[in-house]
Amino acid sequence: MAVTACQGLGFVVSLIGIAGIIAATCMDQWSTQDLYNNPVTAVFNYQGLWRSCVRESSGFTECRGYFTLLGLPAMLQAVRALMIVGIVLGAIGLLVSIFALKCIRIGSMEDSAKANMTLTSGIMFIVSGLCAIAGVSVFANMLVTNFWMSTANMYTGMGGMVQTVQTRYTFGAALFVGWVAGGLTLIGGVMMCIACRGLAPEETNYKAVSYHASGHSVAYKPGGFKASTGFGSNTKNKKIYDGGARTEDEVQSYPSKHDYV
């Protein structure tokens, strides 16, 4: 029971974490204009991984995509890559972990297979979380460096921009979302790995005992009937599986993209 709870909780925590990583990656507020030196500006600038935006006092917001690949800093490209890798690994991890859930029975899948899948998804979640944390941290470091250098624009040289206004950028909401989401994914992955240990078939110190009866040789092995041999008319299994289907629906309905503009 504890194993199922740990596995289920790990899955849910990872799911929330990955949704957060996706949200952070799509958000435009990775860096926001620092208003400390210019609190009276009527034009507010903020930037994401994919575009930069300007919000005027009327509420009108104008966003421009970075329509160049080569003109962008290597660090920004690295952050993009880390976040995408984190999302991809997390998505695969989610897919694997759905089938690894103890409450979902698929064919005659052995507990050892479920344990392996749980471990695989756990590792994927851990790497996914680390990628997100690394990506956000690299970007934050880039911001701090640029802040103290008082650069006019974080992406200097992009599109032939003229450096005229001393606009300094500070941490945006996406960084905090990314850090929290990465942490949740990491925690979820650790929980999956812990659950994997409880799922693995226990090793026994005694050999299988053979009983000879009327010429038939039947071997009884401890725990040999743990895995279900199919759905059949097993209503209990069917009911549990239906529950799993609802979990899949929840995955599909979870917001995967947030537009904060």
């Epitope: 204009q33 210019n38 009276v40 500006t41 009527a42 034009v43 600038n45 903020y46 930037q47 930069s52 935006c53 300007v54 005027e56 006092s57 009327s58 509420g59 009108f60 104008e62 421009r64 006019a152 624009n153 921009m161 003229v162 450096q163 005229t164 206004v165 606009t167």
Partner: antibody, heavy 120, light 113 residues
Framework: EVQLQQSGPELVKPGASVKMSCKAS????????MHWVKQKPGQGLEWIGY????????KYNEKFKGKATLTSDKSSSTVYMELSSLTSEDSAVYCC?????????????WGQGTSVTVSS | DIVMTQSPSSLSVSAGEKVTMNCKSS????????????LAWYQQKPGQPPKLLIY???TRESGVPDRFTGSGSGTDFTLTISSVQAEDLAVYYC?????????FGSGTKLEIK
């Protein structure tokens, strides 16, 4: 058609207060910020502040803090400006002006102005 | 506060002539985020409220004749009237739209000979 109709001229005594109005029509009142501008006779323009009718958020020119108070009434699509502790320096024409949505923070429609004369 | 300085304070021209008036700001009005200049030009005819002519330093407001042209960037801006008409008699103001408090220039009075 967008229209900003301001209240009539005011003649007030020094030390008194005056409240003028600016009724908006022809657009969604809560979607646009309203600015107020002062113009003394034969002189230039001076920005007083703005009010956002959507949430009643205000921003004032430091020079007019304590002097001007901006309010709005959604039901009548009207913004108000109250000037307190009036002196001869406050004798001017006061205009309300709508902040355009895509006009780079410029004011696209102006009221005809309310003339305030402070005299004993 | 950003100080807006307009020159000349007044000018007198004949109908059909080209007119240029200048506006200088104490700080740059160019926003780095979108590379747009936050400066507007207004026309105020006698006894009337100001009317928006140009915003974003160079974008003409709808309904404004194309003889009015705005140019410049950063701290130096220009309003040009390619062929002055009698109805252009007015005071022209430039305005800082970048930072609060919004500030106006002292105005350039255009007279027709």
């Amino acid at each position: 058609e967008v229209q900003l109709q301001q209240s009539g001229p005011e003649l007030v005594k020094p030390g008194a207060s005056v409240k003028m109005s600016c009724k908006a029509s022809g657009y969604t009142f809560t979607s646009y910020i309203m600015h107020w501008v002062k113009q003394k006779p034969g002189q230039g323009l001076e920005w007083i502040g703005y009010i956002n009718p959507y949430n009643d958020g205000t921003k004032y020119n430091e020079k007019f803090k304590g002097k001007a108070t901006l309010t709005s009434d959604k039901s009548s699509s009207t913004v108000y400006m109250e000037l307190s502790s009036l002196t001869s320096e406050d004798s001017a024409v006061y205009c309300c002006a709508r902040l355009g949505f895509t006009t780079r923070n410029a004011m696209d429609y102006w009221g005809q102005g309310t003339s305030v004369t402070v005299s004993s | 506060d950003i100080v807006m300085t307009q020159s000349p304070s007044s000018l007198s021209v004949s109908a059909g002539e080209k007119v240029t008036m200048n506006c200088k700001s104490s700080q740059s009005l160019l926003n780095s985020g979108n590379q747009k200049n936050y400066l507007a030009w207004y026309q105020q005819k006698p006894g009337q409220p100001p009317k928006l002519l140009i915003y974003g330093a160079s974008t003409r407001e709808s309904g404004v004749p194309d003889r009015f042209t705005g140019s410049g960037s950063g701290t130096d801006f220009t309003l040009t009237i390619s062929s002055v008409q009698a109805e252009d008699l007015a005071v022209y103001y430039c305005q800082n739209d970048h930072s609060y408090p919004f500030t106006f220039g002292s105005g350039t009075k255009l007279e027709i000979k």
